[in-house]
Amino acid sequence: LRPSRVHNSEENTMRALTLKDILNGTFSYKTFFPNWISGQEYLHQSADNNIVLYNIETGQSYTILSNRTMKSVNASNYGLSPDRQFVYLESDYSKLWRYSYTATYYIYDLSNGEFVRGNELPRPIQYLCWSPVGSKLAYVYQNNIYLKQRPGDPPFQITFNGRENKIFNGIPDWVYEEEMLPTKYALWWSPNGKFLAYAEFNDKDIPVIAYSYYGDEQYPRTINIPYPKAGAKNPVVRIFIIDTTYPAYVGPQEVPVPAMIASSDYYFSWLTWVTDERVCLQWLKRVQNVSVLSICDFREDWQTWDCPKTQEHIEESRTGWAGGFFVSRPVFSYDAISYYKIFSDKDGYKHIHYIKDTVENAIQITSGKWEAINIFRVTQDSLFYSSNEFEEYPGRRNIYRISIGSYPPSKKCVTCHLRKERCQYYTASFSDYAKYYALVCYGPGIPISTLHDGRTDQEIKILEENKELENALKNIQLPKEEIKKLEVDEITLWYKMILPPQFDRSKKYPLLIQVYGGPCSQSVRSVFAVNWISYLASKEGMVIALVDGRGTAFQGDKLLYAVYRKLGVYEVEDQITAVRKFIEMGFIDEKRIAIWGWSYGGYVSSLALASGTGLFKCGIAVAPVSSWEYYASVYTERFMGLPTKDDNLEHYKNSTVMARAEYFRNVDYLLIHGTADDNVHFQNSAQIAKALVNAQVDFQAMWYSDQNHGLSGLSTNHLYTHMTHFLKQCFSLSD
């Protein structure tokens, strides 16, 4: 009895998580991604905001830019030119959409310790970057691209047709930024900076979404965004390349679109430079099951780019859409023509293939009933990639090295046994030539970042181990987490269950399902998190479960493509199936089951609540999609086809939340949305609310004025407080 008494006295000094802990970010963790500038050097911003250069081989470090210089222009970010002569300092950050923002840029000359005066950059700039060699600058201002040979030089204007909401040069429009690239930029330097490729997006014919931004003026202003919803007119994209050494000579040269792509509506999906005179473009039909990778060469005599049909590689899916969430990008080998790429093998698992001449003759590099997820780096003798192969847990990520210089190629798991209990979910960041790399472990234990030798894989040092977090958590009663699977009708449903600290299987607990469930997503991951649901388990004694059903990723095409053209059916069914299985486990109070989700999760939670099963007492939808006709073309059509009679209109109509308004009568429903949501428009919730009112169904709602899809800032605190009250009331938990 004695040890358990000691144990109990220890537990008495420990406390549960509070909502305040979560809202204050008390238990947030840090990661360390080196800003690599060579094979053995990286930059990092120190705790006191100096920019420090570290040399791994000499062990030396020195400040290249003082916090005083940073502070003098209120800089929040920086970028060193490859020749190390200049640094750009970024200030006045102003967020636009998910990745895009504008900022003011100052150029600091490291050789004389002064800011560059004369020919200063205009403001605000939409995107700015150094060339890969030297100190040329490319930037986008008012939707046009400019070039500077050196920071103090006058600029050369490359494009002139840029116009707000009409023509975008070098930056994507809304839908390309969110759903296709997905980046804030659409320009790419060639490896030595000789050429600059860029995309031009023409949005002139795209319908505009307009919503009010209330601000604090007498009259609200209207935000207008060209936003193609499913079936609407799409942006027209063109790709140009300009010689930056002599840009006025022939001007921008358009890269031809493959004939089989250009015959109907299409997308540009990515651009990869191979050499200074070879470029690889990826294109996609609007019906996103055919992708073409086109390798183009510079023709010196004509000063044009030639994309021979023999260098077109087609990737097609017959069971779903091309790729996973996006079509994968090629990683070229040193011969500058062959490449490595992830796509589905004959068994329907995404694996690395080596393409030398044609896709048909591709050599499969990895195989098995698991998936290769990302190719990090290809060197002369090694290929580094991540996968979820180890111990058959789809929600893990380990880093592997395949030797490609020897035959047969040998495979080594670099991370599998490093810190096995603590670390099962890794990403990596490689220096030039993979001389060194950083591993960032996200969990399931406290995250840790380490530096490694690229040849021996030996750990050199710990970059960040979150010691303060570890100490802070010592007296916190964290919930228990388990990742397991259910086998139901030949479908494997992986789930994560978050259990109260003193969980007792013989007792009954309220259950909250947290769902996302979107195509090619994964919620059940072996990662560390102290968040709202951790608090609900720790303090409020709830059991929380996350389930990856049909449509989710990294478990093969059968599961992934099951939802093709049928969104809103199997994702919901699988959540319901899992809940029934959880009830069978004996520790769930079946009268106190709730479901909540955000975005796609809000759609699934709404449909689950309206499924008529009687399983759910209550639920919350935050910023839900309510009809696929309201969402972006690129995303929606990838999975649903077109909302036309001769395509898939019927399922578009059948899969709306509004069509199930009657079924909300017997559940408590909390509907939440930001009025300035540029992504999932407020329209979605407005239509749900209208349908519920028309059906005379009672429900609760909360809007967040002028908030976007992220509901950030003070709204976050209000949101989670409000949802907590709602759930506690639903579960009859005292405040």
Partner: antibody
Framework: EVQLLESGGGLVQPGGSLRLSCAAS????????MSWVRQAPGKGLEWVSA????????YYADSVKGRFTISRDNSKNTLYLQMNSLRAEDTAVYYC???????????WGQGTLVTVSS | EIVLTQSPGTLSLSPGERATLSCRAS???????LAWYQQKPGQAPRLLIY???SRATGIPDRFSGSGSGTDFTLTISRLEPEDFAVYYC?????????FGHGTKLEIK
């Protein structure tokens, strides 16, 4: 301060050759394209030839193509123009200039006079 | 090649007056790729304007450029004694780059 100093001009007979040099200072020479522009006595300006910063690309006016060769030595910060098969109409002041983007010229050297006459 | 015609050939004005110099192209100059230079006797040309309207570093704001397509203008808002010189326009929107024959601005 950017400085460009031409040299090598002089009197030469038709059919003869001459090599002009332009010594550059005050800027990162290898980062910029450079050009030669000429001005016949009492006449306007005519672009003659250009070369990229690395020296990898060269460009010529039709009137001198095949006769003139532009080159540079980035280690010496010097630009050259080799002029062969000279004609009377090549008589001009030859200026070297920093060439921005294959567009405008700024600054210019003070020029060197080439006279082709028998 | 694009031929640039400058007018007038000679412009006689007094200090303090406004000068308007014209440059017309035989075909459209793409993207307003046009520059203006000033040349004084015995000196090398000096860049005034690039991109049709952007003033070069150190050029006083009394010099301004405008125009697009085939018609371009250099304006000197208030002539100073040192502004009397020959002015050349130059296009770089198409190869080869070409210059106009110049406008001589002389003191009246």
């Amino acid at each position: 301060e950017v400085q460009l100093l031409e040299s090598g001009g002089g009197l030469v007979q038709p059919g003869g050759s001459l090599r002009l040099s332009c010594a550059a200072s005050g800027f990162t020479f290898s980062s910029y394209a450079m050009s030669w522009v000429r001005q016949a006595p009492g006449k306007g300006l005519e672009w003659v030839s250009a070369i990229s910063g690395s020296g990898g690309s060269t460009y010529y006016a039709d009137s001198v193509k095949g006769r003139f060769t532009i080159s540079r030595d980035n280690s010496k910060n010097t630009l050259y123009l080799q002029m062969n098969s000279l004609r009377a109409e090549d008589t001009a002041v030859y200026y070297c200039a920093k060439d921005y983007y294959g567009g405008w010229f700024d600054p210019w050297g003070q020029g060197t006079l080439v006279t082709v006459s028998s | 090649e694009i031929v640039l015609t400058q007018s007038p050939g000679t412009l006689s004005l007094s200090p303090g007056e406004r000068a308007t110099l014209s440059c017309r192209a035989s075909q459209s100059v793409s993207s307003s790729y046009l520059a203006w230079y000033q040349q004084k006797p015995g000196q090398a040309p000096r860049l005034l304007i690039y991109g049709a309207s952007s003033r070069a570093t150190g050029i006083p704001d009394r010099f301004s450029g405008s125009g697009s397509g085939t018609d371009f203008t250099l304006t000197i808002s208030r002539l100073e004694p040192e502004d009397f010189a020959v002015y050349y326009c130059q296009q770089y929107g198409s190869s080869p780059r070409t210059f106009g024959h110049g406008t001589k601005l002389e003191i009246k």
